[in-house]
Interface confidence: medium
């Protein structure tokens, strides 16, 4: 399965939208920064394409879930959020098409499940942090910056997958 070139462009647009969503200065929130333990090893180059597609899918699905909550709607600009949802939805479709074609179904299912679980736990930590911080503007800003970071890392993985073909 070949991810379309538009998928890569969509990833960049998603990052741009996340950048535009910023409302306050992260420098006023340094004390609120938190290490969420992004499971970078689950996105390492050692994985085959078959193993990474479902993990990338889970990553984007979790971002979609995080930003489509009521609390998120109250925190961000509605127009930008709508564009953000559209980009994520398109990327999910691209990745789902690959899964349907059989990529990611055959090899090392246990390793794949572990990776997906690690991504879910990562987002659980983010959700818990937001709850503990009572969804404050600084908490959302810290999370937005973290999602930019982790999404950027997963985008780099997609690019490396493309270049290996």
């Amino acid at each position: 399965c070949d991810l379309p070139q538009t998928h890569s462009l969509g990833s960049r647009r998603t990052l741009m939208l996340l950048a535009q969503m910023r409302r306050i200065s992260l420098f006023s929130c340094l004390k609120d920064r938190h290490d969420f333990g992004f499971p970078q090893e689950e996105f390492g180059n050692q994985f085959q394409k078959a193993e990474t597609i479902p993990v990338l899918h889970e990553m984007i699905q979790q971002i979609f879930n995080l930003f489509s909550t009521k609390d998120s709607s109250a925190a961000w600009d509605e127009t930008l959020l709508d564009k953000f949802y559209t980009e994520l939805y398109q990327q999910l479709n691209d990745l789902e098409a690959c899964v349907i074609q059989g990529v990611g179904v055959t090899e090392t299912p246990l390793m794949k499940e572990d990776s997906i679980l690690a991504v879910r736990k990562y987002f659980q930590r983010i959700t818990l942090y937001l709850k503990e911080k009572k969804y404050s503007p600084c908490a959302w800003e810290v999370v937005r910056a973290e999602i930019m970071r982790s999404f950027s890392l997963s985008t780099n993985l997609q690019e490396s997958l493309r270049s290996k073909e």
Partner: antibody, heavy 118, light 107 residues
Framework: QVQLVQSGAEVKKPGASVKVSCKAS????????IHWVRQAPGQGLEWMGW????????GYAQKFQGRVTMTRDTSTSTVYMELSSLRSEDTAVYYC???????????WGQGTLVTVSS | DIQMTQSPSSLSASVGDRVTITCRAS??????LNWYQQKPGKAPKLLIY???SLQSGVPSRFSGSGSGTDFTLTISSLQPEDFATYYC?????????FGQGTKVEIK
């Protein structure tokens, strides 16, 4: 592609001011911070401060407080760093750098040499 | 301000050698530690951010580790283009501060 293009070298007299520009292109200007870092000849890197390209907010290192001013022009995606009351110790290469996220810089300008000499 | 101390300040090594540079912070900085490479007359280049994350496009022979106060940059097999000066930088709190640099020279 992302680029940060800085203004040319300057020679100034002690007590004068210098204004260095940094023109950004290839990314969403308002989405990121620009930081300034300087390097005296044969020395290490020294952080000067940051500029929020979106709001215009700034933060300066205590050492430069009162002498440095960072501004931006969103219409041209340009950030400026002005340093006043120059002394010979301010002779350095001044870099602007785009902050990715939590304080790391993925793109740097080519540097601007400011020489302070009587 | 947080002080960053790098060691050694310079080292001589040969192509193919494994090189390790350490950086110590005067207080805990979690994993807010970044590594840069600088060649003469050029701007610094980001190698590693957040202590252990490899910047896109940087060869995998570069790796970073550590958290809290002690950090390490490792070049697993030194290449001719790796002879340069390396700086660590903390981004835990402002003012962000850099180590004094480690110059890697040809033996």
């Amino acid at each position: 592609q992302v680029q940060l293009v800085q203004s040319g070298a300057e020679v100034k007299k002690p007590g004068a001011s210098v204004k260095v520009s940094c023109k950004a292109s290839g990314y969403t200007f308002s989405g990121y911070y620009i930081h300034w870092v300087r390097q005296a000849p044969g020395q290490g890197l020294e952080w000067m401060g940051w500029m929020d390209s979106n709001s215009g907010g700034t933060g300066y290192a205590q050492k430069f407080q009162g002498r440095v001013t960072m501004t931006r022009d969103t219409s041209t995606s340009t950030v400026y760093m002005e340093l006043s009351s120059l002394r010979s110790e301010d002779t350095a290469v001044y870099y602007c750098a785009k902050e990715v996220f939590s304080g790391w810089y993925d793109y740097w300008g080519q540097g601007t040499l400011v020489t302070v000499s009587s | 301000d947080i002080q960053m101390t790098q060691s050694p300040s310079s080292l001589s090594a040969s192509v193919g050698d494994r090189v390790t540079i350490t950086c110590r912070a005067s207080q805990s900085i979690s994993s807010y530690l970044n590594w840069y490479q600088q060649k003469p007359g050029k701007a610094p280049k980001l190698l590693i951010y957040a202590a252990s994350s490899l910047q896109s496009g940087v060869p995998s022979r570069f790796s970073g580790s550590g958290s809290g106060t002690d950090f390490t940059l490792t070049i697993s097999s030194l290449q001719p283009e790796d002879f340069a000066t390396y700086y660590c930088q903390q981004s835990y709190s402002t003012p962000y501060t850099f180590g004094q640099g480690t110059k890697v020279e040809i033996k």
